[in-house]
């Protein structure tokens, strides 16, 4: 409530300190501002300041509350409680300051209606404690509590942890417990969250059974406990029983949908909340679905199989067991975490007419067998040419079967002499050889002249993945790219990723910590993610938030997520999944603590101002063995991409990341064109090309292939051995283009042994076909990394 005074006119102007640094905020908090005749006065476009002494005793009915983003309250001795109802209408609130007031109690659910709150300053009040629940679910960047008579107890263990982990600007405040010394020194041995044990039946469970689960809760000061069953839906009839410390749960008449669904027991005390999730496996027989063969780089016969336990598979071709080879093999997509069904492909590498036929997939588990069959025709039999048939003479490379539609000649029914038969036979041979020649010429990308749309990525890239979005080779004409017919959308075979199982992560499981950077697409945050991996209840992740919410951005996001789900390799940055609940859309990646490889190399090179070591990297410049290890890991990631026929198109150290223990992975968060803008050459409107990493054919004809990636890898090697220098750093972009197209090579870096420079040069052959394969490059680097050459950098 307002205590006296009238409501001020809402003539908004900006809040002086803005959402700036903690320091600015603290100064503002203590310095006050110009006096205001009303209890609360508008401030900035969406702020409110309440500084008249003793004018408020609650925050009910603040003027223009629903649009407020900043609320500054000072000198309100009567404002002693902050509760859920006080902030009910403040859904847009970002910054809340209540300082030098009488605040004694903040309800655990006080900020339930202010989910966007990112800065909370409650300094110089009368707070003795603050529940962990108060800040639960908020992404607070700053929390200021200095100047409060805090009472050290387990209830403040969460705050002590924030101080230990450097969260929310808490460490700088050096919080004290009233008469008890620093909060940091508070004993916490007995301050644990509850411990939970969930007993699951060890016998196998069948459809229709009843299952009893029991959750034992132990710990001090238990407050409440329960079950989270949101994933179960119609998987079983649920009956809860018992209470603390032993909760019972009966799942009656279970269905197979219960598989992979989490049943979670939770308990809370004043220290925090604990959750334990279990899954009940319900046995059911195998089932299988087959879909029509689709052509990608390889052909794919898509399938879905289900069953618990997971069925084993067997392919039959025309009724006989099909033995898999490196040309015909089963490939699974990464399974969804919460279902038993698995999707995959029978991959056929460049099949011919001999592979046409009936494909059967047999799935079996101990509870039953199932099979499905499909006819697949990959190519007409080239030897079934009938001299009596009309001879097609026009070729269309767009046609699916390499010859055009209508016959040019009518079938002649008159019997001819031997000479005509011989003539026809000769013609047939000529026709076949011409056909093969045409297919060979027109169909470099596709052996059998069956064309599919190329996959083109927008040049400014949504993120890491879109750099990978070229399947096989692609060439962009100089007019393509942004602003042309592409309009920045990905063009692709629509069936390609339609079955990818993208893992969805709950928003409540993601706790944003702080911002790591910003790109054209949006921001990247460091976050803590709960329930992501079974072996860790929480882990640090990098979260990419999509700024734009347009339908096309959403579709790009979806496609990108599907693609990333497919890319699973120890040297490709791991993609955990997406969060699509609400806005913004989020992508969750593994967090690589040392950041991008370029920055890492520069900070661990001979020129680094301060060569800081760490627990996993020794101080001083990286040694030859380490440089080789880095190079070998990037090569391993590229071997994987090449094997999938993905063309990266922007391989550079800035687009690789370094994690704990000098683990290097390919991947970035789409910020390179913003952070490393000088590495790109702007062509036309918005197209930015990494010309210093590109081979002549990519610069001249926009031709991007696995071979152009090999060239880029050679440049990456050069970057590694120069500790992150920019290629052709002494030249402008146009000069660099001239050098590359004229065939000049980067010089051997000082730290680079001749053996490694020979590898670089093998990557920089002018003719793409002459370049070493990435597989060979990787093998050579691996061999060198295992036994680094003795190399002395003898300075002249």
């Amino acid at each position: 409530m307002l205590r006296g005074g009238r409501r001020g006119q809402l003539g908004w102007h900006s809040w002086a300190a803005g959402p700036g640094s903690l320091l600015a905020w603290l100064i503002l908090a203590s310095a006050g501002a110009a006096p205001c005749p009303d209890a609360c006065c508008p401030h900035g476009s969406s702020g409110l300041r309440c500084t008249r002494d003793g004018a408020l005793d609650s925050l009910h009915h603040l003027p223009g509350a629903e649009n407020l983003t900043e609320l500054y309250i000072e000198n309100q001795q009567h404002l002693q409680h902050l509760e859920l109802r006080d902030l009910r209408g403040l859904g847009e609130l970002r910054n809340l300051t209540i300082v030098k007031s009488g605040l004694r109690f903040v309800a655990p659910d006080a900020f339930h209606f202010t989910p966007r709150l990112s800065r909370l300053n409650l300094s110089f009040n009368a707070l003795e404690s603050l529940s962990w629940k108060t800040v639960q679910g908020l992404s607070l960047q700053e929390l200021v509590l200095s100047g409060n008579p805090l009472h050290c107890s387990c209830a403040l263990r969460w705050l002590q942890r924030w101080e230990e982990e450097g969260l929310g600007g808490v460490p700088e405040q050096k919080l004290q417990c009233h008469g008890q010394g620093p909060l940091a020194h508070m004993p916490n041995a007995s301050c644990g969250v509850p411990t939970l044990k969930v007993q699951v039946p060890n016998a196998s469970v069948d459809v229709g059974d009843d299952v009893l689960l029991r959750c034992q809760v132990e710990g001090r000061g238990l407050e409440q406990a329960g079950w989270i069953l949101t994933e179960l839906e119609q998987s079983a009839t649920v009956m809860k029983s018992g209470g603390l410390p032993s909760l019972g749960l009966t799942l009656a008449n279970v269905t197979s949908d219960l598989n992979r669904k989490n049943v979670t027991c939770w308990a809370e005390n004043d220290v925090g909340r604990a959750e334990v999730s279990v899954q009940v496996n319900v046995s059911f027989p195998a089932s299988v679905q087959l879909h029509t063969a689709v052509e990608m780089h390889h052909w794919c016969i898509p399938f879905s199989v289900d069953g618990q336990p997971a069925p084993s598979l067997r392919w039959l071709f025309n009724g006989s067991v099909l033995n898999e080879t490196s040309f015909i093999f089963t490939e699974f997509l990464e399974p969804a975490a919460n279902e038993t069904v698995r999707h995959g492909c029978l991959r056929l590498n460049q099949p011919t007419h001999v592979n046409n036929g009936n494909y059967t997939l047999l799935a079996a588990n101990p509870f039953g067998q199932a099979s499905a069959s499909i006819m697949a025709a990959f190519m007409d039999n080239p030897f079934e040419f009938n001299p009596e048939d009309p001879i097609p003479v026009s070729f269309s490379p767009v046609d699916t079967n390499s010859t055009s539609g209508d016959p040019v000649e009518k079938k002649d029914e008159t019997p001819f002499g031997v000479s005509v038969a011989v003539g026809l036979a000769v013609f047939a041979c000529l026709f076949l050889s011409t056909l093969l020649l045409v297919l060979n010429k027109c169909g470099r990308r596709n052996k059998f002249g069956i064309n599919r749309p190329a996959v083109l990525a927008p040049e400014d890239g949504l993120a890491m993945s879109l750099h990978f979005m070229t399947l096989g080779g692609s060439s962009l004409s100089p007019t393509e790219g942004k602003g042309s017919g592409l309009q920045g959308h990905i063009i692709e075979n629509p069936q390609y990723f339609s079955d990818a199982c993208v893992h969805h992560i709950k928003r409540r499981d993601i706790v944003l910590k702080w911002e790591l950077g910003e790109g054209a697409f949006g921001k990247v945050f460091l976050a803590e993610c709960h329930n992501l991996l079974p072996e860790q209840d929480k882990m640090l992740v990098a979260v990419k938030a999509l700024k734009e919410a347009s339908e096309s951005a959403r579709q790009d996001f979806q496609r990108e997520a599907e693609l990333l789900t497919m890319l699973q390799h120890q040297h490709i940055v791991r993609f955990f999944g997406v969060c699509t609940e609400g806005r913004p859309l989020l992508m969750v990646f593994e967090y690589m603590r040392h950041g991008d490889l370029n920055r890492f190399l520069r900070s661990h090179g001979p020129d680094a101002k301060l060569l800081a070591g760490g627990e996993d990297v020794a101080p001083g410049p990286l040694g030859l063995g380490q440089l080789l290890a880095v190079a070998s890991q990037v090569a391993a990631g590229m071997v994987y991409l090449a094997g999938l026929h993905f063309v990266h198109r922007d391989l550079a150290t800035r687009n690789c990341l370094v994690g704990q223990g000098l683990v290097v992975k390919i991947g970035d968060f789409g910020m390179s064109r913003d952070i490393y803008s000088t590495d790109y050459y702007r062509v036309g409107g918005r197209t930015m090309l990494p010309i210093r990493w590109m081979p002549p054919e990519s610069i001249l004809y926009r031709k991007f292939t696995t071979e152009s990636d090999v060239w880029s890898f050679g440049v990456v090697l050069w970057e590694i051995f120069t500790y992150g220098k920019q290629p052709w750093y002494q030249l402008s972009n146009t000069e660099a283009i001239d050098c590359i197209t004229q065939g000049r090579e980067l010089e051997r870096p000082r730290a680079c042994p001749p053996e490694v420079y020979a590898i670089m040069r093998g990557c920089w052959q002018r003719e793409p076909q002459q370049r070493h394969s990435i597989k060979d490059v990787h093998a050579r680097l691996q061999a060198l990394a295992q036994a680094p050459p003795v190399y002395l950098d003898v300075l002249g």
Epitope: S204, S283, P285, P309, S312, L313, R314, L316, G319, S320, V321, L362, A364, N365, P366, F367, G368, Q369, A370, S371
Partner: antibody
Framework: QVQLQQSGAELVKPGASVELSCTAS????????MHWVKQRPEQGLEWIGG????????IYVPKFQGKATITADTSSNTAYLQLSSLTSEDTAVYYC?????????????WGQGTSVTVSS | DIVLTQSPALMSASPGEKVTMTCSAS?????MYWYQQKPRSSPKPWIY???NLASGVPARFSGSGSGTSYSLTISSMEAEDAATYYC????????TFGGRTRLEIK
Amino acid sequence: QVQLQQSGAELVKPGASVELSCTASGFNIKDTYMHWVKQRPEQGLEWIGGIDPANGNTIYVPKFQGKATITADTSSNTAYLQLSSLTSEDTAVYYCARGGYDFDYAMDYWGQGTSVTVSS
Amino acid sequence: DIVLTQSPALMSASPGEKVTMTCSASSSVSYMYWYQQKPRSSPKPWIYLTSNLASGVPARFSGSGSGTSYSLTISSMEAEDAATYYCQQWSSNPYTFGGRTRLEIK
């Protein structure tokens, strides 16, 4: 090469229990499924049930549920069949068999069989 | 339960003769499996997935069928083929065997 060695013949009294063993060599039972099949004198074959030794999950024909218990010990690469409350109906040769490696669980290798005679 | 009925229960054939035995299922099964058993021996896998011969099985044997009707054929009977043959389904639990067909040489 793959072999399944079964324990020797058993003569047991009605109402008693018996445990038969089947020791595998030439492969790891954890990688397959292990089955037990019954053949009464001059009769056909009857599948009793099987076990996935990797996790201990079992499956039985309903008529043998309660009569037969299948277990496995991966450290000794051995599967077991325990038969309880024996009657003359249980007099038979019991075979252990390996579920086809990696595909449809059909039985590709069989033990030599263990003869169980229930008689007072 | 799926009941498998084998016929004939007993048959004899002369060397060189073509032999066909059938296995009929009470409801549709995806595939049929066949085993051969000789006196005082364990059964041996003979045909799996309806038409695929187990290793070591002579090419004169073949299997065919679908749905509820399956058969095992010997194109030219030989003395060593005299044995008892069982069909088995692995489509749904309980995994039943057929009653058996005893094949003798004339």
